[in-house]
């Protein structure tokens, strides 16, 4: 059943007090609108029990699994139905509690009346303020039955229901004729769909004996426990003061449970907290009695004393719920109440046991619900108990239900039920959604409905590109939060499926149906700045942009350079592949040719504005080399060349370079400009004394000739060594390149 | 040699008008782009300006937009800078630049003083 | 616009003595990144450019490193010429911008 407990404070001497709280114990609960559950609602139904309007209600939220209803201003506004619904899905539960005004004429006996199909059920209604007139009874509203006012017995007035039914569960009320209705008292029946004992489609099932007033759900055949009890047939009583089906949850204030009525899902209807009875359940049970409304009797053996809580704690050698077993019967020790496994597992299931004779591995054994009997594979033995572990064959479905472990000696037996849950791991039934893209990612939201169990521990991504048989790339993700694929290819499709898994061994779940999503591939939108070129020889061009300042990553992959030569009608197209560079050597080119240069970004396939176009003049092959060049020693550090201009020239000479290299020298060369073309000769100065030189020079036009001959020569001798050659007086720092 | 003379430079009044020059030599001047740097005295350097190499494309500081224009005269080898609504905050050393992936190559520079 | 930060804002050495100069860039500039030298009553000259590249005619005592936003310009034995100003300057994009300057001053 639905983890799912209306809680009413009935201490009403002032109804601005007056609250009721929803709260649940189920995973997930209230969290909203996710793909993880509804919201729990609090709200009075006023279809039934209609009373004046007053200011409405207040509905606070505490956390994800607690609602409260506050802002009652009269009693009269106190009277009525109230109804929480939470759980999710086919699991949707409505947990009802109907008040009665303590100043109304009928007081109801006890409002929640539980009985089994078939039975009679006995409504009885206290007269609390004498009217010598007819009663009439109502169902759900409706005319049922009227009774004189002579007829009732000892003070009150009853209503029999022979051989009830399901259809005739609902809302009853007895009023004194033309009195208000609020003065009513009002009956919650609650038929369950089969006889006692019996559970399931046709009630061919047993219930699985629920103890301390715990109800069988007629659908699933769980015990739904009173407040205070836990454990699969409500055999463990919770620490006092708290409730919840795990005992989780924790009664407010200092006086723990007193005062509150306890609504639980059909077929357990309302009670008090477990040690407190009465009207406003603000009464101790007797010395005794027990447990919720104080119904159960301890009767307890064997020096056993009698808690209100829990029921008879027995002294040390006794257990049992009156202390009437002899722990030298075996027992089953520490036997979980439910335990959960995925579909198709094939798990370990341990049971401990004790006695005196010591249980040995044989006598220990596990029935299935289908009768089948499981003998364990080992034991392992201890001073104080035997454990038996058993294999369990591959899980399925049907072997949902109650199993039981049964310990057999001389000394007696034993056994525990308990209940196992085999759960279906989750599959999507829908493929991940796409919410943003980009050139190298993708963000997709995983949450998506599935066929199976929760709760979703795991969420893994699977994604590969379209058509690729290359291994798929995985990514586990926290199931709550959007996740973004990374490292992608731009422009590029990917199949991406989802696979869910649940807790536990063999939770993860067949893989979701595949989606395509698509890289994005945006535009580039910067325009590069064309800073200049720097013409390198009559064939190379060496160019340099720039771009201009943008917020954010630079959207592009690379640079394209093209050159339009508008003489032949052909366009050459250089790709610079990365975003980050600003220069480019362009190799090649055909010499004495115009032709216009621009510069793109591109990203992908697609290319972002041009810078404005250059026009560029590349010049002719260069000019023929010097003749007859000759070289003269002048001193230690001197030498002078002299040389004839080239011939057959196709323009005027801009400049001559001069190549000096120390003969057998491993170093560079070095390069000295000679910029007035129209010299013949030159003084190359500081140089190495008594040192061997070698010289070759070639002329510039716009780009760079041909070399002259080599020629070699020697400085004089016993110099001081020179800071480096230089030509005439002037430092050549401008002409100097290694 | 490669060189860079500006002139122009002058003391004018708050809201006047200065046109710089900067003539080139030693290097095919229409193949670069050109660039105007200032400083002020005793302070750091502030890019002004900047010319693509056929003077189709230009760029200002947002100190100077809409003040001032640069261009250039591929013909004459020369480079300009006409700056109006003068305001004493563009006091400074005006120097001319050529762009080639850094600024390579500098002239002397030329004094503007914007006073009253 | 790309901020660039130099420290330290004043260095105080002896000739012979190694100064290490840094710039810091408020986003990456790559590797574009240069380095210029200016005496007083000069215009700048440049020593370095695309990080680590020296100038043509720029001793070698002058090296550059770095990339992204943290640079370096190291002198390796300071001669006198060499008190002067320095700024560092990206030219990754436009706008270009300078570091405020560091000066070397002889102690």
């Known amino acids: 059943a639905v983890d799912l407990t209306l809680l009413a404070n009935l201490r009403l001497t002032d109804p601005q007090r007056f609250f009721l709280t929803c709260v649940s114990g189920e995973a997930g609960a209230g969290r909203g609108s996710d793909a993880w559950g509804p919201p729990l609602l609090l709200e009075k139904d006023d279809r039934i029990v209609r009373t004046p309007p007053g200011p409405p209600l207040r509905l606070a939220r505490n956390g994800s699994h607690q609602v409260t209803l506050r802002g009652f201003s009269k009693p009269s506004d106190l009277v009525g139905v109230f109804s929480c619904v939470g759980g999710a899905g086919a699991r949707r539960t409505r947990v009802i509690y109907v008040h009665n005004s303590p100043g109304a004429h009928l007081l109801p006996d006890k409002v929640t009346h539980t009985v089994n199909k078939g039975d009679t059920a006995v409504l009885s209604a206290r007269v609390h303020k004498e009217k010598q007139t007819d009663v009439i009874w109502k169902s759900n509203g409706s005319y049922f039955y009227t009774l004189d006012w002579h007829e009732a017995q000892d003070g009150r007035f009853l209503l029999q229901l022979p051989n009830v039914q399901p259809p005739s569960s609902g809302i009853y009320s007895a009023t004194y004729l033309e009195a208000s209705p609020l003065g009513s008292a009002f009956f919650r029946l609650i038929v369950r769909g089969c006889g006692a004992g019996r559970w399931g489609p046709g009630c061919t099932k047993e219930c699985p004996g629920c103890l301390h007033g715990g109800v069988c759900h007629d659908h699933d055949g769980e015990c739904v426990c009173p407040p205070g009890f836990t454990g699969t047939r409500c055999e463990q009583a919770c620490r006092e003061g708290r409730f919840g089906q795990s005992c989780q949850e924790q009664c407010p204030g200092i006086s723990g449970c007193r005062g509150l009525t306890f609504c639980l899902p059909d077929p357990y209807g309302c009670s008090c907290g477990s040690g407190w009875r009465g009207s406003q359940c603000q009464e101790a049970c007797a010395p005794g009695h027990f447990g919720a409304d104080c119904r159960l009797q301890c009767q307890c053996q064997n020096g056993g004393t009698c808690d209100r809580f829990s029921g008879c704690v027995c002294p040390s050698g006794w257990h049992g719920v009156h202390c009437e077993k002899s722990d030298r019967i075996p027992q089953i020790l520490n036997m979980a109440s439910e335990l959960e496994f995925n579909l198709e597992t094939m798990p370990r299931i341990n049971c401990a046991a004790a006695g005196n004779p010591f249980p040995v591995r044989g006598s220990i054994e596990l029935r299935k619900p289908d009768g089948t009997v499981l003998l364990s594979t080992k034991a392992i033995v201890e001073p104080e108990k035997t454990t038996a572990e058993f294999e369990v064959p591959r899980l399925v479905l049907a072997d949902s239900g109650f199993w039981e472990c049964r310990v057999s000696t001389s000394g007696g037996q034993d056994s525990r039920r308990f209940k196992v849950n085999v759960k279906v791991p989750p599959v999507p039934l829908a493929a991940p959604r796409l919410l943003t893209k980009q050139s190298r990612q993708l963000v997709v939201s995983p949450l998506v409905s599935f066929s199976g169990d929760g709760p979703i521990s795991t969420v893994r991504l699977h994604y590969r590109p379209q058509d690729s048989t290359m291994d798929w790339s995985t990514i586990v993700v926290d199931p709550s939060e959007n996740v973004t694929l990374m490292n992608l290819r731009p422009k590029t499709g990917y199949s991406v499926r989802v696979q869910l898994s649940r807790p536990g061994e063999g939770g993860e779940g067949a893989w979701g149906p595949p989606t395509l999503m698509t890289t994005d591939c945006p535009e580039p939108l910067l325009q590069p700045w064309l800073e200049g070129w720097h013409v390198e020889g009559t064939d190379r061009l060496r160019v340099s942009w720039s771009l201009p300042l943008v917020p954010g990553p630079l959207v592009g992959d690379g640079f394209l350079l093209r050159l339009w030569d508008g003489t032949r009608g052909q366009e050459r197209r250089e790709n610079v592949s990365s975003p980050q560079a600003r220069t480019a050597l362009l190799t090649g080119l055909t010499p004495g040719t115009h032709y216009q240069l621009d510069v793109q970004l591109y990203h992908c396939t697609l290319l972002g504005p041009a810078s404005p176009p250059a026009h560029v003049l590349l010049p002719p092959s260069g000019p023929p080399a010097p003749r007859h060049l000759h070289a003269q020693a002048l001193s230690d550090s001197e030498i002078q060349l002299t040389w004839k201009h080239p011939e057959a020239l196709p323009g005027p000479i801009s400049k001559y370079v001069v190549e000096v290299q120390v003969a057998g020298g491993a170093g560079d060369p070095l390069w000295i400009d000679v910029d007035r073309p129209e010299e013949t000769s030159t003084i190359i100065r500081g140089l190495n004394a008594s040192t061997r030189y070698l010289f070759r020079m070639r002329a510039s036009i716009q780009g760079l000739g041909d070399w002259s001959n080599t020629v070699e020569e020697s400085t004089l001798g016993n110099g001081l060594q020179a800071e480096g050659p230089v030509q005439e007086s002037r430092a050549a720092e401008e002409g100097l390149d290694q | 040699e490669v060189q860079l003379l500006e002139s122009g430079g002058g003391l004018v009044q708050p809201g006047g008008s200065l046109r710089l020059s900067c003539a080139a030599s030693g290097f095919t001047f229409s193949h670069y782009g050109m660039t105007w740097v200032r400083q002020a005295p005793g302070k750091g350097l502030e890019w002004v300006s900047v010319i693509g190499p056929s003077g189709g494309n230009t760029m200002y500081a947002d100190s100077v937009k809409g003040r001032f224009t640069i261009s250039r005269d591929n013909s004459k080898n020369t480079l300009y800078l006409q700056m109006n609504s003068l305001r004493a905050e563009d006091t400074a050393v005006y120097y001319c630049a050529r762009v080639w992936g850094a600024f390579d190559i500098w002239g002397q520079g030329t004094m503007v003083t914007v006073s009253s | 616009d790309i901020q660039m930060t130099q420290s330290p804002a004043t260095l105080s050495l002896s000739p012979g003595e190694r100064a290490t100069l840094s710039c810091r860039a408020s986003?990456?500039?790559?590797?574009?990144l240069a380095w210029y030298q200016q005496k007083p009553g000069q215009a700048p000259r440049l020593l370095i450019y695309?990080?680590?590249n020296r100038a043509t005619g720029i001793p070698a005592r002058f090296s550059g490193s770095g990339s992204g936003t943290d640079f370096t310009l190291i002198i390796s034995s300071l001669e006198p010429e060499d008190f002067a100003v320095y700024y560092c300057q990206q030219r990754s994009n436009w706008p270009r911008t300078f570091g405020q300057g560091t000066k070397v001053e002889i102690k």
């Open positions: 695309d990080a680590s």
């Open positions: 986003q990456s500039v790559s590797s574009y």
